[in-house]
Interface confidence: low
């Protein structure tokens, strides 16, 4: 399987909410011995590999934000800890998973990584990640709503997030 990032860049005004999204692509084993972890963290564009550095999002580690379930089951973070920090991660039946950040500040700007780990009990684990940039802007140049830029080069038209 692979992870797709529908949007590579999110440009948002301060105070807005944003939902960063990743999508699990390809065949997903739904067997009893397969479990999926999905999570989010901040990183930097390293020389060797993007997303190798794992930093917290608003002081929450990716352990705090993780979802675990089998196959394409739905899940979301219900614990108060994340919500107190204005964060919620969620996953649906179709392989989409996301993190919602509320009341953005300039400090939220940076590189965000989604990580999926497929664990096959007694066998191995397989990890894939996706990266996207969040730019939080203030002042007269800031957009009135979040503007997202598709990852694919052939589809460069801006899409305004709902």
């Amino acid at each position: 399987f692979k992870v797709a990032t529908p949007y590579s860049l999110y440009v948002c005004p301060e105070g807005q909410n944003v939902t960063l999204t990743c999508r699990l692509l390809g065949p997903v084993d739904k067997g009893h011995d397969v479990t999926f972890y999905k999570t989010w963290y901040r990183s930097s564009r390293g020389e060797v590999q993007t997303c190798s550095e794992r930093r917290p999002i608003r002081n929450l580690t990716f352990q705090d934000l993780h979802l675990h379930h089998g196959g394409h089951q739905a899940a979301n973070t219900s614990h108060d800890l994340a919500q107190r920090h204005g964060l919620e991660s969620a996953s649906d039946h179709h392989g989409n998973f996301s993190i919602t950040m509320r009341n953005l500040t300039l400090l939220d700007s940076g590189l965000y990584c989604c990580l999926v780990v497929e664990i096959r009990h007694h066998h191995s684990e397989h990890r894939v990640h996706g990266a996207m940039e969040l730019q939080v802007q203030t002042g007269k140049d800031a957009p009135s709503n979040c503007v997202v830029y598709p990852s694919s080069s052939q589809d460069s038209e801006n899409i305004t997030a709902a």
Epitope: D33, T35, Y37, T39, G46, E47, V48, Q49, S52, E53, R54, T61, F62, Q63, H66, H68, V117, I119, H121, H122, H123, S124, E125, R127
Partner: antibody, heavy 120, light 107 residues
Framework: QVQLVQSGAEVKKPGSSVKVSCKAS????????ISWVRQAPGQGLEWMGG????????NYAQKFQGRVTITADESTSTAYMELSSLRSEDTAVYYC?????????????WGQGTLVTVSS | DIQMTQSPSSLSASVGDRVTITCRAS??????LNWYQQKPGKAPKLLIY???SLQSGVPSRFSGSGSGTDFTLTISSLQPEDFATYYC?????????FGQGTKVEIK
């Protein structure tokens, strides 16, 4: 601060079994992979297997398959490693190790080690 | 299984020296490579994770590089407390495997 505290040294006869415990404190237990790594005298590090308590099932190195059992008790935040059919070459220090990164196998927390001596 | 081969198996160096230890994987492991330091009678200590990320609390004289199959641990200026055995470890796939170790001794 996470701490892993292991049970004390053991002296065992060949053919018997040993069960070593590893109690975690200072952090959540269930979602983190706990591994067992052994080191024979003067030798290198050897991964035996690991368990993610929330999943309940363990993952073993082929070399130990059928002879090692790794379990976890979420209620006491304790992981166990049982090795059966002991032989002299199993004499080693056995470490439990854990990652800060949940399911991963980057070991930034280690127990103090448990010396298991197999001798007739 | 993924085999990890370290070189050299031992080396002698002086305080202040620049020391380089290499680790080679039998197949590509991307950057899923960690380095540990172990002193006699003690548990290993994580120095570098993800090939090049410095573990919190580890002095900046330690650095890691590489990707794929070839990796390097560098100590830019060896200190007295750095004399120890160093291990690489891949966590790309289970079974987890370690290199055989490199003992850094005082010249």
């Amino acid at each position: 601060q996470v701490q892993l505290v292991q049970s004390g040294a053991e002296v065992k006869k060949p053919g018997s079994s040993v069960k070593v415990s590893c109690k975690a404190s200072g952090g959540t237990f269930s979602s983190y992979a706990i591994s067992w790594v052994r080191q024979a005298p003067g030798q290198g590090l050897e991964w035996m297997g690991g368990i993610i308590p929330i999943f309940g099932t363990a993952n073993y190195a082929q070399k130990f398959q059928g002879r090692v059992t790794i379990t976890a008790d979420e209620s006491t935040s304790t992981a166990y490693m049982e090795l059966s059919s002991l032989r002299s070459e199993d004499t080693a220090v056995y470490y439990c190790a854990r990652s800060s990164y949940g399911w991963s196998y980057e070991f930034d927390y280690w127990g103090q080690g448990t010396l298991v001596t197999v001798s007739s | 299984d993924i085999q990890m081969t370290q070189s050299p198996s031992s080396l002698s160096a002086s305080v202040g020296d620049r020391v380089t230890i290499t680790c080679r994987a039998s197949q590509s492991i991307n950057n899923d490579l960690n380095w540990y330091q172990q002193k006699p009678g003690k548990a290993p200590k994580l120095l570098i994770y993800a090939a090049s990320s410095l573990q919190s609390g580890v002095p900046s004289r330690f650095s890691g590089s590489g990707s794929g199959t070839d990796f390097t641990l560098t100590i830019s200026s060896l200190q007295p407390e750095d004399f120890a055995t160093y291990y690489c470890q891949q966590n790309r796939a289970t079974p987890i495997t370690f290199g055989q170790g490199t003992k850094v001794e005082i010249k």
